[in-house]
Structure formats: structure tokens, C-alpha cells
């Protein structure tokens, strides 16, 4: 037997206990699929959250964060304060990255500079609080008499010749 509630469209809710089963969702509530037993209350984007998409009778509101904050979690469930590049967010606020670490974004933690020597390479450009070090060729590649490597010429695409 087909559930009579399956005839109720999105934007309505269904009550099995009544002859007339479909009712419209009240203001500020929604049902995103047919056959729902209840309408869900619309999410309200308040405080540090701002509305990215308004609620409708068939879909929930979507929030993002006000300037100076960024989303965390599924569906932007939290807003976290932005920091400057070269900083990370701690319990006491934004703090500069310690020497030997960097952060090139407004969010996240300071990460250690790449250790070029682990790959047998030298430091080409020093790191800063905002940027990682740039590793260069290995010291052996820089010794006198080392041949320079020429990149190969690009292969011609097979198939079509000029018309």
C-alpha cells in the first residue's frame, strides 16, 4: 500500500491522523522533500553569521560569515576569526608565527618551514612568517663542472596536420 503522505510535496507536511493530510509549512519553516511528517524551522543567520541564501518553504537558509571571519564545519556550523598572514589563532587571539614557521592564509595554524636538506637541496629563498622557504638545486648540482639540464622539446600532438 502506498503511503498517502508521499503525495504531499516539498513545502508541506503530512499528518496521517487526518483525512486532509497535506498542510503548508508555516512561515520560517521548510520541508525539502515530499512526504515529510513535519516542517523544520529555518536556520537563522545571526550575529557573526550572515545569510548567504534565504530560507524558503522548500529549502533551508544557508549562512556564511561576516568579513573578518571564516566558516568551519559542515554547512558553516561555526565562524572563526581571521588572522593576518604570518599569524595563527590562539586562545588569546591572533599571534605571530614563531621563527621557523609560516602561515600564508588568514586561517589555520603556522607550519614549519620545509627542511630543504632532508631532500638534499639547498635553501634558495629564505622563509618568512608569511612564506615557506624555497628550496633550490642540491649543492652537488651547483658544483663547478656540473652540466646544466636542458628540458626536452615538447612532443608534437599526434593526429592532425595543418589543413
Amino acid at each position: 500500500l502506498q503511503d498517502p503522505c508521499s503525495n504531499c510535496p516539498a513545502g508541506t507536511f503530512c499528518d496521517n491522523n487526518r483525512n486532509q493530510i497535506c498542510s503548508p509549512c508555516p512561515p520560517n519553516s521548510f520541508s525539502s522533500a515530499g512526504g515529510q511528517r513535519t516542517c523544520d524551522i529555518c536556520r537563522q543567520c545571526k550575529g557573526v553569521f550572515r545569510t548567504r541564501k534565504e530560507c524558503s518553504s522548500t529549502s533551508n537558509a544557508e549562512c556564511d560569515c561576516t568579513p573578518g571571519f571564516h566558516c568551519l564545519g559542515a554547512g558553516c556550523s561555526m565562524c572563526e576569526q581571521d588572522c593576518k598572514q604570518g599569524q595563527e589563532l590562539t586562545k588569546k587571539g591572533c599571534k605571530d608565527c614563531c621563527f621557523g614557521t609560516f602561515n600564508d592564509q588568514k586561517r589555520g595554524i603556522c607550519r614549519p618551514w620545509t627542511n630543504c636538506s632532508l631532500d638534499g637541496k639547498s635553501v634558495l629563498v629564505n622563509g618568512t612568517k608569511e612564506r615557506d622557504v624555497v628550496c633550490g638545486p642540491s649543492p652537488a648540482d651547483l658544483s663547478p663542472g656540473a652540466s646544466s639540464v636542458t628540458p626536452p622539446a615538447p612532443a608534437r600532438e599526434p593526429g592532425h596536420s595543418p589543413q
Epitope: 503525495n7 504531499c8 510535496p9 516539498a10 513545502g11 508541506t12 487526518r18 486532509q20 497535506c22 498542510s23 503548508p24 509549512c25 508555516p26 512561515p27 520560517n28 541564501k53 534565504e54 524558503s56 518553504s57 522548500t58 529549502s59
Partner: antibody
Framework: EVQLVESGGGLVQPGGSLRLSCAAS????????MHWVRQAPGKGLEWVAY????????YYADSVKGRFTISRDNAKNSLYLQMNSLRAEDTAVYYC???????WGQGTLLTVSS | EIVLTQSPATLSLSPGERATLSCKAS??????VSWYQQKPGQAPRLLIY???NRYTGVPARFSGSGSGTDFTLTISSLEPEDFAVYYC?????????FGGGTKVEIK
């Protein structure tokens, strides 16, 4: 800003036909069911018809069933009410409203008279 | 269909007074009752939904209460702009229905 603007009303003879339109803006029209509600001069409000957001579900008041047809064009953000076999008692201001019944248009007057 | 009966039909009050409007349903409608304000030549304006929730931008002097079959709209202290006709409506089941209205007029 949410706006609903009805049009198409006028004077029609009994037995005649007319199509009302409702142009929606300021919200995602395709995500809302829509209603037509009418108000006879000096009288109360009477619900006329409902259409779901995708147009698959439609309900009518008994007083208009078989004579009126509600439809929508989500690409044009428009709602319609095709009215046939009009009677004197259909004379009213016709309002369109979102399914939350929170926003209403300004209404368009239909007069059925010979 | 569900019949909504509003009383009184007319309420004559002065600005600053308290207005109490009643709406009775012919059968249980849960809390699916809304209240609307209508002024001459204008469309209805939603004031209260879900029996007691004030809609966005509606002044705090408007409040709604009730559930089941008995509902009340209260205007705590009438302002000059509050003199209008008030309708209750139910969205518990189709057909949606409205009460006959209560006119709040200046005494």
C-alpha cells in the same frame, strides 16, 4: 525586497473568461508554493487555489473547482489563474501570496457583470 | 472545511487602550493559526503565525496566544495606525480558511 504584482483584472460578462498573472521578485520563486486568495467588495478573505513549488500538486476551493486553473512558470517567476465560466459571485480583488502566506500582492480587481 | 469565527465583529476603543480579539475554530487546528491586519485599499499584512510567533518587523505590542480551537490576538496599547480590520486564518488543512474579521475602530 519581496514583491508580488498581480495584473489582468477587469470587467467581464458572466460566462466569460480571463487570465490573471502574478509577477514575483525578490525571492527564489521556484522554491515556494503559491496561493491565490480573493476578497469580494466589503467582505472577508477567501482562499482560491494553491500550487506547489514545482507545480506537481494543486488544490482548489470547491467554489472554483472545474472552472479555475492555477499554473506557474518558474523560468518567468510568474503565477497564473485561468478563470472560465465566470459568475457574478467571482467579483473580487484577487491576491497572490507565497505559501507561507506572509507576502501578498496589491491585488487586481475582477468584476463580473453584464 | 474548518470554520473560523471571530468576535467581536467591531471593537470601539481609544488610542492607548488594550484590544483583545478572539478567533474560534470549528475543530482542532493545533497552533496553525495566523493573524492579519488589513487597512482600506491595502493587502493583508501578516502579524502573527503559529498562533504566537510575531512576524518579522511586527511591533512587540502585538501578541498572539491559544491552541486547539481558541485563539486570541492582543494589542497591548493601541496606536493610531492600529485601527484596521483583523483576520485570523488557519493553515492546518485545505481549504485554507479565514475568519470574518474584527474591525478595530476609534471610539
Amino acid at each position: 525586497e519581496v514583491q508580488l504584482v498581480e495584473s489582468g483584472g477587469g470587467l467581464v460578462q458572466p460566462g466569460g473568461s480571463l487570465r490573471l498573472s502574478c509577477a514575483a521578485s525578490g525571492f527564489t520563486f521556484s522554491e515556494f508554493g503559491m496561493h491565490w486568495v480573493r476578497q469580494a467588495p466589503g467582505k472577508g478573505l477567501e482562499w482560491v487555489a494553491y500550487i506547489s513549488s514545482g507545480g506537481s500538486t494543486i488544490y482548489y476551493a470547491d467554489s472554483v473547482k472545474g472552472r479555475f486553473t492555477i499554473s506557474r512558470d518558474n523560468a518567468k517567476n510568474s503565477l497564473y489563474l485561468q478563470m472560465n465560466s465566470l459568475r457574478a459571485e467571482d467579483t473580487a480583488v484577487y491576491y497572490c501570496a507565497r505559501d507561507w502566506v506572509d507576502y501578498w500582492g496589491q491585488g487586481t480587481l475582477l468584476t463580473v457583470s453584464s | 472545511e474548518i470554520v473560523l469565527t471571530q468576535s467581536p465583529a467591531t471593537l470601539s476603543l481609544s488610542p492607548g487602550e488594550r484590544a483583545t480579539l478572539s478567533c474560534k475554530a470549528s475543530e482542532n487546528v493545533g497552533s496553525y493559526v495566523s493573524w492579519y491586519q488589513q487597512k482600506p485599499g491595502q493587502a493583508p499584512r501578516l502579524l502573527i503565525y503559529g498562533a504566537s510567533n510575531r512576524y518579522t518587523g511586527v511591533p512587540a505590542r502585538f501578541s498572539g496566544s491559544g491552541s486547539g480551537t481558541d485563539f486570541t490576538l492582543t494589542i497591548s496599547s493601541l496606536e493610531p495606525e492600529d485601527f484596521a480590520v483583523y483576520y485570523c486564518g488557519q493553515s492546518y488543512s485545505y481549504p485554507l480558511t479565514f475568519g470574518g474579521g474584527t474591525k478595530v475602530e476609534i471610539k
